[in-house]
Structure formats: structure tokens, C-alpha cells
């Protein structure tokens, strides 16, 4: 059975096809070769010998057992190497040898139970080390480390690590990896030596299920005094074996550390008291909690100093007492609990994302909502009802605005976006708004990207409503239940780009609105009703277009439409997907494909 | 098509089929055996994905009775710092995990439950595995 | 089993040209690809030109494109490269070398060539 090819000449997949060699068959430009699940068993010298072009190498699940000398020889442009479920027993010291360019290496899961005689000490540019799921029982980074000096991310997770000496890390005093992220998650550690992280620099550190009672989780992390971090994630997994205490002695030891970034990643534990849990973190600059249960919300009004609040997939009681003087940046995403937002009090914050909460908002929106004239970026997308009854006062700052997928009312009863003349992304999308109004988006002089899609127009009419929106460069009108539009409609979007009119209720189709949308290159008319054209002479598009979309439309393939049909024939060299045009009417023309109908009429004499 | 029998209890009887064509290999075993009218107990899987189960969800199909209820999305791995251990499981990795699970106080009429799980993973998107359950309710009381 | 020698190679200035042969012998009917490879002193040894028996489909190593051409000529079961424009940097021990349907990599014992003023 042959190979699928991808990408004609460049991407070949041949996974799960029986191969016992490699395949001889394929072209010498070949970049990207996956032989995964195919019972290879045996690399010999120059394996790959009819492939010097490779870039990504996949052998996941080949039965490897041996590699002998050189098996990778001449793969001098090879990045990303990928041997992961291979039971390897034999692994020749040269192995590796020629892969002068390869910057990620997957060896997960192949019986690697050292890194001592792991022969990699020569491949200089190796970015990304994973050798987790393995049965490596010692930490200790062999002397090759120092000449890896690119390596940012090595992943140990999933092994047999049980203690961490002082000795282990000599090599990172020797040259500082400041870029090194390492994961040791899921390793049984019981032990970490006061000292080892001492002087240690490391962009992340992630431990995860790594401690099976708070006493050795208490040591473990006294262990790491002296360790500067940017970013330290520690945590548990819902599906292995959780604590069954967890208090505030767990993180005393972080104050010894120096830490830029905090997150806890799943916790299977109530957390009470968050002042006294965190004390050691008052001052990171950013602070993340993910899939935690938090019982008392008024915590978050203590005066911590982060920069950053990151609360994911957590259940809260109630919405949280937020008072954070030094906030910047609030996710609040895909929460539970607390249904009904309530007032925050961040005088600084730019960036606040609220998105995918099902909160409702008794009043939206204005700076006493949020306690900042700052907000550059909202996003309350995914929520419940937002009721509009303040336009947005306090809040003239805002770049970014996101609603889609919420319950908006009162859209259409004052222009609520008037202030909002810094606003360049609105994305009202799937609102449940009405547009009765034709001032709804007046003020927006600098929005450049509207998305207004699945939304509903009074009358099935598009009137002048865009007539301030003179920077606009996308608009998405799809799923609007649309059947008319004002001749005018467009008529100052001078620097429309992208236009989406898909999946409306057009029956017919004019060029005449468009004749002021000079920079216009996409128009996507797709699945509406479109049978013919609204007057008997159409125009030409803006010069600009390039992409016209008229796919799944209901075309009528008979003689009294000829000249529309020839016009979309001239068309051609700007439709896409012409095979997905076809004919509707009359019955025996339907599913033809319109630009391969050939109508002959005769003029009644 | 083949049915895999997973287990019986005192009110529900659970088997599934395969519904994509390429059938690999999943095995599945429930301790104890779910009960409808509450239940808790340990799910256990052993699989080798063909995929990376980065950013992991499953499509839900469920049918009561040949009622169709609307399609349910449930992501498992949002794709950083996720709850689950296999959800940094690459293509190839043996994945052999347990998951507990628990629910009370549902009360399920007796009939014949179907439940399509679509599994999609990676990026860009594809389907992982497609398997059918068939959940046979018979309520002692209800 | 496949036997490989090489011939051809010299001294030669830079700018100059040089012909190299590689004739093949023994299961000659089992190659599927043969080419050249070439390794400089204190570097690996790397591709610098391919050919495919059964489609004559060719690779040529960016360092070379344009210069050097690979041929065959199947009734002597011998393969040659072409080299032009010699740089200093095309100094190498020049091998040739076979692949055979087993995945089996077969080698010549190399031929030195120096460009040199």
C-alpha cells in the first residue's frame, strides 16, 4: 500500500501500513516523513540515505530495538525526530551522528533508564529534549549538558526520579541555561537536597503529582531554596493519586525562591485561606489558578502585588471580592459558581477577560463596573444576559471588545459604542441583537474589524449603519437572516478588505452597493438563495477584488438568466471553488456545475 | 459490526461498537459497574493514540429511546497545565489510565440509551477514535 | 553483494572541472539508488548528488546545484559526476555509493579531490 501524499514532493504519510524497511519510493525532496506504527525493528547505517532533505522525522511505534552507527547519517537539515513507544535495547554510541540541525528530540517511552549513556552530547543545537515515561531513576545532568547550549525544554516527566542531590545540577552552575524549562512531573520524589536549586536560573519549573503526602511536598520545596524561576507551576492531575492534606505549611518554602510567575494546576482540595496559602507569593508578578475550588471569594481584595490574575476552570461560591491596586490583566474564564457579576475594583487594569463564565451583567458597562478607566481589552464572550445601560463611560480607552456568544439586550435603543472612538475589534457575533437602530455603531470612527455574524436586522434590511465606520477593514454579516440591503449600505467603507455575507436570504445579486469599496478583496456571497441578478446589467466588481465566493447558491440555469450566467462565466478568474456552483433549476440541469453549462438560446423572432 | 461488552450491573447493561473505520484498538473497563440510579466507581482505559491528545474533546451523540438530544461538546485538555496526566500522552505513548467517577439522584426512564463519543485531538483537528455505547436500562424502581 | 570502485579524481585549480566514475559490480540488479557523497576533514560526510535507477530522478546538494551533474550509464552499470566551476571548499574525499531494495547501503573506498591554486 503506498504512502498518502500530503504535500506533493514535501509531506508523506506512511503510518500503520505493515512497511518492515523504509520505503524507497519516495521523492529525494521529501521533508516531512511519518512512519509511525509500521515494525521497522532494526536502523541500520544510513537508514535514510535516499532522503536528504528530511525536516521531520516521525517513528513513533516502530518496533525499534536497535540503532546502529550512523542511522540518521546524512540527515543534515533534520529539526524534529520522533521515537516515542519504541522498546529500545540496543542504542550504538553514534546513533545520533550527522544530525547537525536537529532542535527537538522525542525519545518518550523507549526504555531509557540513563541519561549518562543517553549520545546526544553532540548535538549542539537541540532545543527540546522529552524523555518522559521513561525509567530514569537519577536527576543527574551528564557533563554533555554543557555543550547543549540552546537546550530551553527538557521534560522528565513520568519517571523514576526520587531524589535530587546537590551534585545533579553541577553542570547548569557551569553554564547557566537561562532559557531551560524543565518538567518533572509525576516523578515519586521524597527527597530534594537543601542547596541544589541554589544560584540554579530556570525559565519554568513544573512539579506536578510529584509529592504523596504534604510532609514530603513541605521538604521537597524547602529543597528548592535559592532557585531563581520565571515561571513555577506546581499542581496535581484529576485522574493520578491526590493529597489528602494540603494547608499553608505546603508553600512556606517559597519564600526562599525567587519566582516571576505562579500557577497551581489542579488541586483537589478546598482552599480556604488564600492570604495565609500564599503568602510567600504576595509579590510575583503574575499569580495563576487553574481547576481549584476556592471557598472564600473576599481574599482576592488583599493587597497582593501581582500584575497578572489568571483564574481558570476554578468553582467559586460566588463571584470574587476583587480590590488589587497592581492588576494589569484579569482572565476569569470558564469558572463556576457565582452566576451574577458583581463589581471589581482594579484602578490599573488594561486587559480583562470575563469570557465563558455564563455570568449575567444586571448593567454593562462603565468604569464603576470594573474600577479602571485603563481597560484597553474586554472580553465577555460566552456569557449570560448583558443588559446594555451605560455606553461605556470611563472606558473611552478600550482597543478590544468581545461579546460573541452572549445575551445582549437593549442594543438598539441608543448608540451604546458613542464613546468608543479608540475601539479597532468588535465582535458582536450570535448576540441575540436586533438591529432597529441605525445609530448603533455610531462613535466607532477607528473600528477596523466588525463581526456581527448570526444576528437579526429589522425587516431582513441592511439600512445605513456603518456610515462612521470609515476605517473598517472586516465585516462579517453571515447568518444575519438577511434579504435586502440599502444601495448605500457600504458606501464609506473605503477600506473594506473582507466582506462576509455568507449564509443569508439573498435571492439575487447586485453589484451596484459595492462600487465605493475600492480596497475590497474578499466577498463571500456562499450559501444564500442567489438565483440571478437584481437588474438585468451587472457591473464589475471594485478592481481590488480578488476572492468572490458564490458557492451553494440556488442558481436558475435557464435561458431568461443568460446573461447573468455569462457574466459569472467572466467572473471566473475570481471564484472559488466553481466545482461547489451548481445548478438549481430547471430539474433536469440540477447539480450541474454552472461553469460548464453551455447555454445555446434562441431569440424569439 | 463487532460489539465489545463492557459490563453489567443490578439496572444497566453497557456495550459499544466502533464507529469509524479505523478500529484501533481501546480497551475499557468500569469498576464497579455503573448503576443509573447513582453510581461511583473507577473508569479505567488502556489505549495507544494515533494522535497527541493535546487539546482533547469529545463530540456526545446521545439518543434515549430514538430521542435525539442536541450534540454535546466536552473538552477534556484545553492544551497547557491541564487536569488530566494524559493529556500530554503523544502519539505512539501508551496511555493507561484510571478515572474516578461519581453521580446521584438521576432518575433515567427504562429504555435503550445511545451515546456516540466522537474523540477529536491535536492540530489541526482530527478524529482520534469514534466509539458507540449502548446503555440498556432496566430500573428496579423508578 | 555490491562492489563499488571509484576513479577520477586529482588536483585541479579552482574554476576547473573534473569527471568522476563509479562503476558497479556484483547484485547490481538489487540497487535502487546510487549517489555521491563527499566529507571534508573534521566534518561529516554529506550528500552531494543522487540518482534513482528506476525513474532517473536526481538530488543535488544546494553547494552544488548548478555546477556539478550526476548520470548513468546503465550498460556499464557505472554512475559519474560531472564537476564545474571547482571551488576551494569542494575539496573532499569523494564517495560513491549504492542503496540496495534491502535498505542496505553499499560504499566505494573514496577518491580525493583537491582544488587548489
Known amino acids: 500500500e503506498p504512502c498518502v501524499e500530503v504535500v506533493p514532493n514535501i509531506t508523506y504519510q506512511c503510518m500503520e501500513l505493515n512497511f518492515y524497511k523504509i520505503p524507497d519510493n519516495l521523492p529525494f525532496s521529501t521533508k516531512n516523513l511519518d512512519l509511525s506504527f509500521n515494525p521497522l525493528r532494526h536502523l541500520g547505517s544510513y537508514s535514510f540515505f535516499s532522503f536528504p532533505e528530511l525536516q521531520v522525522l516521525d517513528l513513533s511505534r516502530c518496533e525499534i530495538q536497535t540503532i546502529e552507527d550512523g542511522a540518521y547519517q546524512s540527515l543534515s537539515h533534520l529539526s524534529t525526530l520522533i521515537l516515542t513507544g519504541n522498546p529500545i535495547q540496543s542504542l550504538a554510541l553514534g546513533a545520533f551522528s550527522g544530525l547537525s540541525s536537529l532542535q527537538k528530540l522525542v525519545a518518550v517511552e523507549t526504555n531509557l533508564a540513563s541519561l549518562e549513556n543517553f549520545p546526544i552530547g553532540h548535538l549542539k543545537t537541540l532545543k527540546e529534549l522529552n524523555v518522559a515515561h521513561n525509567l530514569i531513576q537519577s536527576f543527574k545532568l551528564p557533563e554533555y549538558f554543557s555543550n547543549l547550549t540552546n537546550l530551553e525544554h527538557l521534560d522528565l516527566s513520568s519517571n523514576k526520579i526520587q531524589s535530587i542531590y546537590c551534585t545533579d545540577l553541577r553542570v547548569l552552575h557551569q553554564m547557566p541555561l537561562l532559557n531551560l524549562s524543565l518538567d518533572l512531573s509525576l516523578n515519586p520524589m521524597n527527597f530534594i537536597q537543601p542547596g541544589a536549586f541554589k544560584e540554579i536560573r530556570l525559565h519554568k519549573l513544573t512539579l506536578r503529582n510529584n509529592f504523596d503526602s504534604l510532609n514530603v511536598m513541605k521538604t521537597c520545596i524547602q529543597g528548592l531554596a535559592g532557585l531563581e524561576v520565571h515561571r513555577l507551576v506546581l499542581g496535581e492531575f484529576r485522574n493520578e493519586g491526590n493529597l489528602e492534606k494540603f494547608d499553608k505549611s505546603a508553600l512556606e518554602g517559597l519564600c526562599n525562591l525567587t519566582i516571576e510567575e505562579f500557577r497551581l494546576a489542579y488541586l483537589d482540595y478546598y482552599l480556604d485561606d488564600i492570604i495565609d496559602l500564599f503568602n510567600c507569593l504576595t509579590n510575583v508578578s503574575s499569580f495563576s489558578l487553574v481547576s481549584v475550588t476556592i471557598e472564600r471569594v473576599k481574599d482576592f481584595s488583599y493587597n497582593f502585588g501581582w500584575q497578572h490574575l489568571e483564574l481558570v476552570n476554578c468553582k467559586f461560591g460566588q463571584f470574587p471580592t476583587l480590590k488589587l491596586k497592581s492588576l494589569k490583566r484579569l482572565t476569569f474564564t470558564s469558572n463556576k459558581g457565582g452566576n451574577a457579576f458583581s463589581e471589581v475594583d482594579l484602578p490599573s487594569l488594561e486587559f480583562l477577560d470575563l469570557s465563558r463564565n455564563g455570568l449575567s451583567f444586571k448593567g454593562c458597562c462603565s468604569q464603576s463596573d470594573f474600577g479602571t478607566t485603563s481597560l484597553k481589552y474586554l472580553d465577555l464572550s460566552f456569557n449570560g444576559v448583558i443588559t446594555m445601560s451605560s455606553n461605556f463611560l470611563g472606558l473611552e480607552q478600550l482597543e478590544h471588545l468581545d461579546f460573541q456568544h452572549s445575551n445582549l439586550k437593549q442594543m438598539s435603543e441608543f448608540s451604546v459604542f458613542l464613546s468608543l472612538r479608540n475601539l479597532i475589534y468588535l465582535d458582536i457575533s450570535h448576540t441575540h441583537t436586533r438591529v432597529a437602530f441605525n445609530g448603533i455603531f455610531n462613535g466607532l470612527s477607528s473600528l477596523e474589524v466588525l463581526k456581527m455574524a448570526g444576528n437579526s436586522f429589522q425587516e431582513n434590511f441592511l439600512p445605513d449603519i456603518f456610515t462612521e465606520l470609515r476605517n473598517l477593514t472586516f465585516l462579517d454579516l453571515s447568518q444575519c437572516q438577511l434579504e435586502q440591503l440599502s444601495p448605500t449600505a457600504f458606501n464609506s467603507l473605503s477600506s473594506l478588505q473582507v466582506l462576509n455575507m455568507s449564509h443569508n436570504n439573498f435571492f439575487s445579486l447586485d453589484t451596484f452597493p459595492y462600487k465605493c469599496l475600492n480596497s475590497l478583496q474578499v466577498l463571500d456571497y456562499s450559501l444564500n438563495h442567489i438565483m440571478t441578478s437584481k437588474k438585468q446589467e451587472l457591473q464589475h466588481f471594485p478592481s481590488s477584488l480578488a476572492f468572490l465566493n458564490l458557492t451553494q447558491n440556488d442558481f436558475a440555469c435557464t435561458c431568461e438568466h443568460q446573461s447573468f450566467l455569462q457574466w459569472i462565466k467572466d467572473q471566473r478568474q475570481l471564484l472559488v471553488e466553481v466545482e461547489r456552483m451548481e445548478c438549481a433549476t430547471p430539474s433536469d440541469k440540477q447539480g450541474m456545475p454552472v461553469l460548464s453549462l453551455n447555454i445555446t438560446c434562441q431569440m424569439n423572432k | 459490526q463487532k460489539q465489545y461488552w463492557v459490563c453489567n450491573s443490578s439496572d444497566a447493561s453497557i456495550s459499544y461498537t466502533y464507529c469509524d473505520k479505523m478500529q484501533y484498538p481501546i480497551s475499557i473497563n468500569v469498576n464497579p459497574c455503573i448503576e443509573l440510579k447513582r453510581s461511583k466507581g473507577l473508569l479505567h482505559i488502556f489505549y495507544i493514540p494515533r494522535r497527541d491528545l493535546k487539546q482533547l474533546y469529545f463530540n456526545l451523540y446521545i439518543t434515549v429511546n430514538t430521542m435525539n438530544l442536541p450534540k454535546r461538546k466536552e473538552v477534556i485538555c484545553r492544551g497547557s497545565d491541564d487536569d488530566y496526566s494524559f493529556c500530554r500522552a503523544l502519539k505512539g505513548e501508551t496511555v493507561n489510565t484510571t478515572i474516578s467517577f461519581s453521580f446521584k439522584g438521576i432518575k433515567f426512564s427504562k429504555g435503550k440509551y445511545k451515546c456516540v463519543v466522537e474523540a477529536i485531538s491535536g492540530s489541526p483537528e482530527e478524529m482520534l477514535f469514534c466509539l458507540e455505547f449502548v446503555i440498556l436500562h432496566q430500573p428496579n424502581s423508578n | 553483494e555490491v562492489q563499488l570502485v571509484e576513479s577520477g579524481g586529482g588536483l585541479v585549480q579552482p574554476g576547473g572541472s573534473l569527471r568522476l566514475s563509479c562503476a558497479a559490480s556484483?547484485?547490481?540488479?538489487?540497487?535502487?539508488?546510487m549517489g555521491w557523497f563527499r566529507q571534508a576533514p573534521g566534518k561529516e560526510r554529506e550528500h552531494v548528488a543522487l540518482?534513482?535507477?528506476?525513474?532517473?530522478?536526481?538530488y543535488y546538494a544546494d553547494s552544488v546545484k548548478g555546477r556539478f551533474t550526476i548520470s548513468r550509464d546503465n550498460a556499464k552499470s557505472t554512475v559519474y559526476l560531472q564537476m564545474n566551476s571547482l571551488k576551494p571548499e569542494d575539496t573532499a574525499v569523494y564517495y560513491c555509493?549504492?542503496?540496495?531494495?534491502?535498505?542496505?547501503?553499499?560504499w566505494g573506498q573514496g577518491t580525493q579531490v583537491t582544488v587548489s591554486s
Open positions: 555509493a549504492a542503496k540496495t531494495g534491502t535498505s542496505f547501503v553499499y
Open positions: 556484483g547484485s547490481i540488479f538489487s540497487i535502487n539508488d
Open positions: 540518482i534513482r535507477f528506476k525513474d532517473g530522478s536526481i
